[in-house]
Every structure is written in structure tokens, then in C-alpha cells.
């Protein structure tokens, strides 16, 4: 859930007031706010559906909710990409699409979403509780991944509800000079704002509404999402084919769009460098990668002179790491 | 820099079979899909199928589904193609490509002859 | 499995001129989904592999001439080179990106007068 914040307007102290020093500490902070509060984090969604007619055919959904390009999709099983998980299909935008057995179509809803299905016939079908993971990589945001299973419970027919992926992986991949000075920014602002706590407060003048109001995006989940996130973690069955993961299942909820928060801790890593994090008390892992992603063996999405976002496989023209196209 | 090496040539008779290799280097081998395709001297090219290392399974033009076996080795990073019962109609450069043909072999030339 | 066809399969030209070459598909390379061609060009000069020049019908691979210019949308498409080069001699083919089996054109030859 997104929400709108609007961040006051710093009235000019008086001059001579606080000097050069004292206006740069006024106009510092109030940069670095605005950086924070604009870095918004992007969300991945993932849905997971069992055909009536087909009982071991699976159609996964996925969609990236970010303002960056996306410039490669891959869909894997039995875990996120690269952890354990097998690539099933590798959406580019521009390049094409490819698919490996059991996928039988996989294919671009919008822009942002894509769609996979799965026929279950032999040794590589799906089961119920197989985990689905699906990884956006887009510009300049990184990679996102965020994976889903079917509730073990789940009629043939129904759809798992989009609520918060069991297994959220971000790849912090865009810009780590960025994201450095970001989160430099904002320890230095918190540093900033505790050391003026005992001076007087600078006038503040409420900003008009505009459409520059920078956005602050909060993570709220809805019930359906607090109550999926709280389901204690569960040991998948591992006689299904692809290995899988011990992963919550979320359980029923309202909506079958709820988005899945792909919320990650900036965690200063090596490029490459995975850290899983259980968090028990909701049910999920985080995984955070940071790193130059060069578009592995992909063409690069337009990131201008220097900088190229690198999933391997020609990622579709695909990235560096598990996946790739191109 | 990501490279693609394969053998300059293998000679063949008629009714045997060719395993032919496309080594990797440069790039991490289980992230992108190697593609195989056929040239026939003075033809055009056509596209035999593809195979992801990552999760070793194939797609294969349906022309090509009794004639070529696609496998890969991650160890070593090379992917293989075997064409079996091979007739004068085999006789081609045979090229793989990483990914989206971003990169390209330089090409195996497999004469059928007896 | 989708045909495509290239004309002319051969031209000769002098350098410095204008060269433009078609390929038609015969069913739609469009993806309905995010409106993007599924077709790409490729460069082939003798006794070499092929060499990626375009991509999604109209974007240039990374390290391609800018005289190279893809355009068209569904079925019909065209390769542009603005000013032939002596080094472009080579063969082109169009290549359905769009759906397996990933067919190629018959290519279509250019020669330099």
C-alpha cells in the first residue's frame, strides 16, 4: 500500500541568523529528507492458480508495481532463482520470451505483468505446494522477486491470494553508489535532526498541494496481508519434483489482486553476496543482493553512459545470476 | 567478454552419429540458454532448438526432434548437441548462441561423407 | 511455425547510397500484452557467424552503426542503412523472436558496386 506524504516546505531562516553554517545544516537535512522519502520501494506480486479442469495445471501470474523499465522476467519453481530454484520461463521485453517444460505458455499480460502456465503431465509436473518465484529486473530499482504456493487446502480452480510472497528477494542492483549515499543520507539526517532537537524549530510553512510533493511509500499491509504474514513457517512436502523450500503458506484473503510488498533491508553486501533473513515472527524471508547487475548476455536497458544493469542471461539478454535471456 | 568456442570440423559417414561441444567462458554459464542452429552451405539458417543449463530442458523444432539431442554439461560449461543417423542432408555449420543469439560460436562444420 | 519472407534476396549498391531491405512474417510478431515486435536482424559477413544487429524490430543492439535502422510493427518490416559502407557487405536475415520455433528469412544478400 502505497500513501501520499506531503513534506513541509522549509521557510529561509532570517538572514545573519545562523550564518553560512547554519544554512547549510537548514538545507542538508531537507535534501536528504526529500531523497529519503522519494526512494521508494517497488512491490512484486505473485499468483498462484490451479485450473478446474486440469488438476496439475498451474497458472502463475506475476506483476511488478514500480516505476522503473523493466527490462527481464524470470520464473522459476522450487524457490527463488538461484537458490535452489529452476528457471521455467525468461520474459524480455524486447528480445522474446523463452520457456522450458512444464511451461506451455508464457507470455506478457501488460508492460508490467506477465503470465505462466503450466501443464502437469510426468515426472516434472507441478504439485500443490511447489513454490513459484517470479524476478523482475528493472531500471533503476534492481531485481525484485517475490515467491508464492497454493494454500495446501486450495480448491482446484481457485487462486491463492496475492498476499505477501513467502520469499521476497530484492536485488538491490540499481545504482549502489545511490542506494550508498541514500542510506548515508539518511543516517546523516536522523544525526542532523536529533542534534537541532534542542534548538529553536525553523519556521515551517505548509507546502500547497503539488504534483512535485514527493511520495512516501509506507508498507501497510491489509489484514489478509498481516494474517498471511503471521502464518508460522511450514515444511513443504519435497516428493513433488522440483526441490523446494521451507516457506509459509498464506492462507485465504479478500482480494485476489493485493499486491506483494517486496520490501528489503539495506544491507550493505558484497555484489553477489545473497543474506537470507528469516523473519519468524512474519512468516517470510528477505533476501537482499547488492551489486552492479551488468545485463548478462543481455542487452543493457538504456541506463546511459557507464552503467549497465547485469542479469546474465543474455538477459533476455538476461542478468548475471540465476536467469537468463539474451 | 563472453565466448562460445566449438570444434572447427568433424567428418562423418553416413548412418553414424556426431556429438559436437560448445564450450562456455566469460559469463556464467547456468544463467543464460544455449541455442543451436543449422546452415547449410550457401542456405539459409534454421533453428534446431535451445537449452537451459539451469534447468537441462531442451525445446527442439519439431524438424529436428528425432535427429538432434540436446545436453549440457555445467562442470564444465559446455553444452552439447548430438545429430544421429546422419545422411548427406547433416552435412552444415552448425552454430550456438548464448541467450538471445547475443553471442554466436564460431560455427562446427560437419560433412556426412562416406 | 511462422514464415518469413525477405526481398530482394540480393542488391548492389555503391557506397555512400541508401540500402533498404523488407521482411514480412506470416503471422504477427506483435505482443499483444506490451506492444512490442518480436523481431530481430541479423548481420552476416563471409565465413563468419551471424551477428546481432537489431532487436525488437527497431532497437540497435549495443555497438551497431546508428546507419542501421529497424522499423515496422506486426507482419511487415524493413532494415535501413543509411550510408553503405564497404564493410557491410554481408548477408541480412529477419528472425521471428515472437514464438518457437524461432524462424529465420531466406536472408537477402547486399553486394557493394
Known amino acids: 500500500m502505497r500513501t501520499e506524504a506531503q513534506v513541509p516546505a522549509l521557510q529561509p531562516p532570517e538572514p545573519g541568523l545562523e550564518g553560512a553554517m547554519g544554512h547549510r545544516t537548514l538545507v542538508l537535512p531537507w535534501v536528504l529528507l526529500t531523497l529519503c522519502v522519494t526512494a521508494g520501494t517497488p512491490e512484486v506480486w505473485v499468483q498462484v492458480r490451479m485450473e478446474a479442469t486440469e488438476l496439475s495445471s498451474f497458472t502463475i501470474r506475476c506483476g511488478f508495481l514500480g516505476s522503473g523499465s523493466i527490462s527481464l522476467v524470470t520464473v522459476s519453481w522450487g524457490g527463488p532463482n538461484g537458490a535452489g530454484g529452476t528457471t521455467l520461463a525468461v520474459l524480455h521485453p524486447e528480445r522474446g520470451i523463452r520457456q522450458w517444460a512444464p511451461a506451455r505458455q508464457a507470455r506478457w499480460e501488460t508492460q508490467s505483468s506477465i503470465s505462466l502456465i503450466l501443464e502437469g503431465s510426468g515426472a516434472s509436473s507441478p504439485c500443490a505446494n511447489t513454490t513459484f518465484c517470479c524476478k523482475f529486473a528493472s531500471f533503476p530499482e534492481g531485481s525484485w522477486e517475490a515467491c508464492g504456493s497454493l494454500p495446501p487446502s486450495s480448491d482446484p480452480g481457485l487462486s491463492a491470494p496475492p498476499t505477501p510472497a513467502p520469499i521476497l528477494r530484492a536485488d538491490l542492483a540499481g545504482i549502489l553508489g545511490v542506494s550508498g549515499v541514500l542510506l548515508f543520507g539518511c543516517v546523516y539526517l536522523l544525526h542532523l535532526l536529533r542534534r537541532h532537537k534542542h534548538r529553536p524549530a525553523p519556521r515551517l510553512q505548509p507546502s500547497r498541494t503539488s504534483p512535485q510533493a514527493p511520495r512516501a511509500r509506507a508498507w501497510a499491509p491489509s489484514q489478509a496481508s498481516q494474517a498471511a504474514l503471521h502464518v508460522p513457517y511450514a515444511t513443504i512436502n519435497t516428493s513433488c519434483r522440483p526441490a523446494t523450500l521451507d516457506t509459509a503458506h498464506p492462507h485465504g484473503g479478500p482480494s485476489w489482486w493485493a499486491s506483494l510488498p517486496t520490501h528489503a533491508a539495506h544491507r550493505p553486501q558484497g555484489p553477489a553476496a545473497w543474506a537470507s533473513t528469516p523473519i519468524p515472527a512474519r512468516g517470510s524471508f528477505v533476501s537482499v543482493e547488492n551489486g552492479l547487475y551488468a545485463q548478462a548476455g543481455e542487452r543493457p536497458p538504456h541506463t546511459g553512459p557507464g552503467l549497465t544493469l547485469f542479469p546474465d542471461p543474455r538477459g533476455p539478454r538476461a542478468m548475471e545470476g540465476p536467469l537468463g535471456v539474451r | 567478454q563472453a565466448q562460445l568456442q566449438q570444434p572447427g570440423a568433424e567428418l562423418v559417414k553416413p548412418g553414424a552419429s556426431v556429438k559436437m561441444s560448445c564450450k562456455a567462458s566469460g559469463y556464467t554459464f547456468t544463467s543464460y540458454w544455449i541455442t543451436w542452429v543449422k546452415q547449410r552451405p550457401g542456405q539459409g539458417l534454421e533453428w534446431i532448438g535451445d537449452i537451459y543449463p539451469g534447468n537441462f530442458s531442451p525445446n527442439y523444432n519439431e524438424k529436428f526432434k528425432n535427429k538432434a539431442t540436446l545436453t549440457v554439461d555445467t562442470s564444465s560449461s559446455t553444452a552439447y548437441m548430438q545429430l544421429s543417423s546422419l545422411t548427406s542432408e547433416d552435412s552444415a555449420v552448425y552454430y550456438c548462441?548464448?541467450?538471445?543469439?547475443?553471442?554466436w560460436g564460431t560455427g562446427t562444420t560437419v560433412t556426412v561423407s562416406s | 511455425d511462422i514464415v518469413m519472407t525477405q526481398s530482394p534476396s540480393s542488391l548492389s549498391v555503391s557506397a555512400g547510397e541508401k540500402v533498404t531491405m523488407s521482411c514480412k512474417s506470416s503471422?504477427?510478431?506483435?505482443?499483444?500484452?506490451?506492444?512490442?515486435?518480436?523481431l530481430a536482424w541479423y548481420q552476416q559477413k563471409p565465413g563468419q557467424p551471424p551477428k546481432l544487429l537489431i532487436y525488437g524490430a527497431s532497437t540497435r543492439e549495443s555497438g551497431v552503426p546508428d546507419r542501421f535502422t529497424g522499423s515496422g510493427s506486426g507482419t511487415d518490416f524493413t532494415l535501413t542503412i543509411s550510408s553503405v559502407q564497404a564493410e557491410d557487405l554481408a548477408v541480412y536475415y529477419c528472425?521471428?523472436?515472437?514464438?518457437?520455433?524461432?524462424?529465420f528469412g531466406s536472408g537477402t544478400k547486399l553486394e557493394i558496386k
Open positions: 548462441a548464448k541467450g538471445y543469439f547475443d553471442v
Open positions: 528472425q521471428n523472436d515472437h514464438s518457437y520455433p524461432f524462424t
Open positions: 503471422q504477427s510478431l506483435l505482443n499483444s500484452g506490451n506492444q512490442k515486435n518480436y
